[in-house]
Interface confidence: low
Amino acid sequence: QLPPGKPEIFKCRSPNKETFTCWWRPGTDGGLPTNYSLTYHREGETLMHECPDYITGGPNSCHFGKQYTSMWRTYIMMVNATNQMGSSFSDELYVDVTYIVQPDPPLELAVEVKQPEDRKPYLWIKWSPPTLIDLKTGWFTLLYEIRLKPEKAAEWEIHFAGQQTEFKILSLHPGQKYLVQVRCKPDHGYWSAWSPATFIQIPSDFTMNDEQKLISEEDLGGEQKLISEEDLHHHHHH
């Protein structure tokens, strides 16, 4: 029988900067019942606080509700594991809520084949930001990524949409049934899960010649190719 092994706080996430949750991995239990407690203080404060809610986030978690969450305040936290033989502490983790946001997936994904008589056909994709994210005040800039593939294909085709909530795609296989999904991330946070897939049947007459394809990419601003330097800076996967 031994003191508990060292726990590790391995993840903290916030859906919207208003609340957040952290999770830890227990170390070895030393063969004895072990109690875990998370304590924290905020940068610039000396007063230590205990986790306000061990329930909401599930096992080995601490949830910080609205009244415990401050934007741009760094939280310094650690987990204490205790059994009859002694205690061990995790390393301190520094958490700034601004940088741990993982939003819910975008909503209301709609996909439509557009075939204007006088122009090139294209796939039109539209969606809405997740409801928990308050975009109006500008604290969030959400970036979006779309993926699509023919139903039976193995590989996804990925398009970065920047801050747009709609997107046009030109090059598709006629007659195929496509799966389309979208996800989002704040500029300093993590990608959401992919939205539920939407299916779209591409008509058999969805065709264009090479000349049309080149023209249409110009017409549409080259969305599939031209990513700004700022977008490239933010276009990383966590």
Partner: antibody
Framework: EVQLVESGGGLAQPGGSLRLSCVAS????????MSWVRQAPGKGLDWVGN????????NYVDSVRGRFTISRDNAKNSLFLQMNSLRAEDTGVYYC?????????WGQGTLVTVSS | DIQMTQSPSSLSASVGDSVTITCRAS??????LDWFQQKPGKAPKSLIY???ILQGGVPSRFSGSGYGTDFTLTISSLQPEDFATYYC?????????FGPGTKVDIK
């Protein structure tokens, strides 16, 4: 160092127009919302409106909506306030401000006087 | 619109005094609140953001607290350069709104 420099203020007739400019330096202008705030002589601060990073969205206080237009030119690090149908109550110092991650930065202001 | 009220509207104090200014929002604004200091003829200066976080370079005698609808700005030991007008502002919803200001002058 963050700097915001407003210009374009002056005397205008009621019903007239003015265009204010604000040139920014010391931060990546194109990645932040920008705001205009005004202050009538001897009075408090009033938020006028703001504009999204790419210029695609503007928000205004009701008293100026339909008369004032906020725009920006990210290539020139510039913010603009086009003021039409000016009224006496629009008189005051107009500040441009940026809501950076950690607080606001403000210009020195430019005075707008609406009088006949 | 969210209405912001401040009290007192003015106060007289001496150097070394502790001063507290209160700001109240007409509805819950979480911690989406700033405090500004403005001296005559100058632009406002950001002191505190997110209700309680001191802006870089602002002396530690300034502190902010509150959450929801009630907020306070405290100056623990008033210095000559602190005589000014102080404004709170909410940025929870549009339009952003300022309090009417509290003027702190020399007794």
């Amino acid at each position: 160092e963050v700097q915001l420099v407003e210009s374009g203020g002056g005397l205008a007739q009621p019903g007239g127009s003015l265009r204010l400019s604000c040139v920014a330096s010391g931060f990546t202008f194109s990645t932040y919302w920008m705001s205009w705030v005004r202050q009538a002589p001897g009075k408090g601060l009033d938020w006028v409106g703001n504009i999204k990073q790419d210029g695609s969205e503007q928000n205004y206080v009701d008293s100026v909506r339909g008369r004032f237009t906020i725009s920006r030119d990210n290539a020139k690090n510039s913010l603009f306030l086009q003021m039409n149908s000016l009224r006496a109550e629009d008189t005051g110092v107009y500040y441009c401000a940026t809501l950076l991650t950690k607080g606001d930065y403000w210009g020195q202001g430019t005075l707008v006087t609406v009088s006949s | 619109d969210i209405q912001m009220t401040q009290s007192p509207s003015s106060l007289s104090a001496s150097v070394g005094d502790s001063v507290t200014i209160t700001c109240r929002a007409s509805q819950d604004i979480s911690n989406y609140l700033d405090w500004f200091q403005q001296k005559p003829g100058k632009a406002p200066k950001s002191l505190i953001y997110a209700a309680s976080i001191l802006q870089g370079g602002v002396p530690s005698r300034f502190s902010g607290s509150g959450y929801g609808t009630d907020f306070t700005l405290t100056i623990s030991s008033l210095q000559p350069e602190d005589f000014a007008t102080y404004y709170c502002r909410q940025y929870k919803t549009y339009p952003f709104t300022f309090g009417p200001g509290t003027k702190v002058d020399i007794k």
